[in-house]
């Protein structure tokens, strides 16, 4: 009679993470008597995956009933496959012995490869806001994929970026991999509505890449431009001065009026108007009673935007051009902000 052979017909098996792997094995004879064992890897460090004789294997099921006397099918199924299960599996026949069974013959091995999807890319930007014309860095991370081959692209508003560096770790063999990429983006004043997108393509995604996004509204700070103008005289002894604060982002803004260097009024931007590009405009006005001033008045509009150092714009109010009203001792009238916006 021909000597028993252990046949593993599949040289390799490819399984998606979470699915069940079937590892096929048959013996050509019932003799010698003894159990079958499955191992991952070879040599002294091999891992026992299934033992027909003893042990408890909650992830493994046999394809056929191994208790039947004439059974020669020793195929197994391993459920809930993860990348950690990748490796070469050997079906090994043992000969009954005393006190221990003796290894008799091994199959050629089946390499189990596991395909695992990458996690959703996470994009993160700089910790502090930056202003237009500055270059900022964005990072993108995705984990847990296998095999190692992966493609990562960066986009800004649909336009592909070229200034980025990408690493896939670890460099050597591993059960799963991670990707880390850093892209450099130059900010413009129009970027409040812009998005940076990291796109990851992998064989497991079947042509439908994963995307992670970051809104540049979280990153950009557009400083305001200021213009102080004197409006036509409302009454004989009153002058209306406006400070137009234009094209700023984010909204957090505090404005202070100074008359000859002395604080006249402070207010916080509340009712703003939004421009098409996502920036804001706001206007504050001050009613100055010129009859209270003997000399020219220097009016300053001072703006502190988003916690940054204050910027200011001044306007010289010529008092001599206006008749003085006797008996008035009010320097300025607290009027609050005007809800009209002047462009």
């Amino acid at each position: 009679e021909e000597e028993l052979q252990v046949i593993q017909p599949d040289k390799s098996v490819l399984v998606a993470a979470g699915e069940t792997a079937t590892l096929r094995c048959t013996a050509t004879s019932l003799i010698p008597v003894g159990p079958i064992q499955w191992f991952r890897g070879a040599g002294p460090g091999r891992e026992l995956i299934y033992n027909q004789k003893e042990g408890h294997f909650p992830r493994v099921t046999t394809v056929s009933d191994l208790t039947k006397r004439n059974n020669m099918d020793f195929s197994i199924r391993i459920g809930n496959i993860t990348p950690a299960d990748a490796g070469t599996y050997y079906c090994v026949k043992f000969r009954k012995g005393s006190p221990d069974d003796v290894e008799f013959k091994s199959g050629a091995g089946t390499e189990l490869s596991v395909r695992a999807k990458p996690s959703a890319p996470v994009v993160s930007g700089p910790a502090a806001r930056a202003t237009p014309q500055h270059t900022v860095s964005f990072t993108c991370e995705s984990h847990g994929f296998s095999p190692r081959d992966i493609t990562l692209k960066w986009f800004k508003n649909g336009n592909e970026l070229s200034d980025f560096q990408t690493n896939v770790d670890p460099v050597g063999e591993s059960v799963s991999y991670s990707i880390h990429s850093t892209a450099k983006v130059v900010l413009t004043r129009e970027d409040v509505h812009s998005q940076v997108i990291c796109e990851v393509a992998h064989v497991t995604l079947q042509g439908d890449p994963l995307r992670g996004t970051a809104n540049l509204s979280e990153t950009i700070r557009v400083p305001p431009t200021l213009e102080v103008t004197q409006q036509p005289v409302r009454a004989e002894n009153q002058v209306n001065v406006t400070c137009q604060v234009r094209k700023f982002y984010p909204q957090r803004l505090q404005l202070t009026w100074l008359e000859n260097g002395n604080v006249s009024r402070t207010e916080t931007a509340s009712t703003v108007t939004e421009n098409k590009d996502g920036t804001y405009n706001w206007m504050s006005w001050l009613l100055v009673n010129v009859s209270a001033h003997r000399d020219d008045v220097k009016l300053t509009c001072q703006v502190e935007h988003d916690g940054q150092p204050a910027v200011s714009k001044s306007h010289d109010l010529k008092v001599s051009a206006h008749p003085k009203e006797q008996g008035s001792n009010t320097a300025a009238e607290n009027t609050g902000s005007n809800e009209r916006n002047i462009y």
């Epitope: 003893e54 042990g55 408890h56 809930n80 993860t82």
Partner: antibody
């Protein structure tokens, strides 16, 4: 830390069905290689394994009790249940909820035990 | 099913003495599948030794285990007052998992 708490009726009538619940905390039964089971101990006697269920829903039963026993898990509620039908006085015992861990290479053992609940079968 | 037989049924010793508890299996089992538990009165059992000779977490090293095939031993080198309890061996070699009937270690 890991905690297991059995609950159920202290007294069951013969021929009725015994229902026990084990509420656990400190771990998840969604985790690979973790299972939950039941072991009982009649007063003054030894330990008898009844059944256990793994994270992947595979169930194992003691063949001496299998026709009367059902084990189930509710992962969302972090609970495991045991039902034992057609009870007799021989089913009177302290019932322990246990966590069983799989350590690879066919090795599994009972790592954590509840304090046990005494169930008496009597009319 | 695999039947585990523990001996002696009761062991009477004094603190400081050495205790040797035996567990015999009706079938040959690999040493990796034989475990020991300790149970004190009114308490649940707790894992003492796994895989014949490995101490579970928090178990003092006066406990040790040995054996192979069908014969396994639990040894306590110097008995402490808190060691007096019932000890059970358990096999995880085959379903159904089974326990020995227990050895009661009592103070002499």
């Amino acid at each position: 830390q890991v905690q297991l708490q059995e609950s159920g009726p202290g007294l069951v009538k013969p021929s009725e069905t015994l229902s026990l619940t084990c509420t656990f905390s400190g771990f998840s039964l969604n985790t690979y290689d973790i299972g939950m089971g039941w072991i009982r101990q009649p007063p003054g006697k030894g330990l008898e394994w009844i059944a256990h269920i793994w994270w992947n829903d595979r169930e194992y039963y003691n063949s001496a009790l299998q026709s009367r026993v059902t084990i189930s898990k509710d992962t969302s509620k972090t609970q495991v249940s045991l039902k034992l039908s057609s009870v007799t006085a021989a089913d009177t015992a302290v019932y322990y909820c246990v966590r069983i861990d799989y350590f690879g290479s066919g090795q599994a053992w009972f790592t954590y035990w509840g304090q046990g609940t005494l169930v008496t079968v009597s009319s | 099913e695999i039947v585990l037989t523990q001996s002696p049924g009761t062991l009477s010793l004094s603190p400081g003495e050495r205790a040797t508890l035996s567990c015999s299996s009706s079938s040959t089992i690999s040493s990796t599948y034989l475990h020991w538990y300790q149970q004190k009165p009114g308490q649940a059992p707790r894992l003492l030794i796994y895989g014949t000779s490995n101490l579970a977490s928090g178990i003092p090293d006066r406990f040790s285990g040995s054996g192979s095939g069908t014969d396994f031993t639990l040894t306590i080198s110097r008995l402490e007052p808190e060691d007096f309890a019932v000890y059970y061996c358990q096999q995880g070699s085959r379903i159904p998992f089974t326990f020995g009937q227990g050895t009661k270690l009592e103070i002499k």
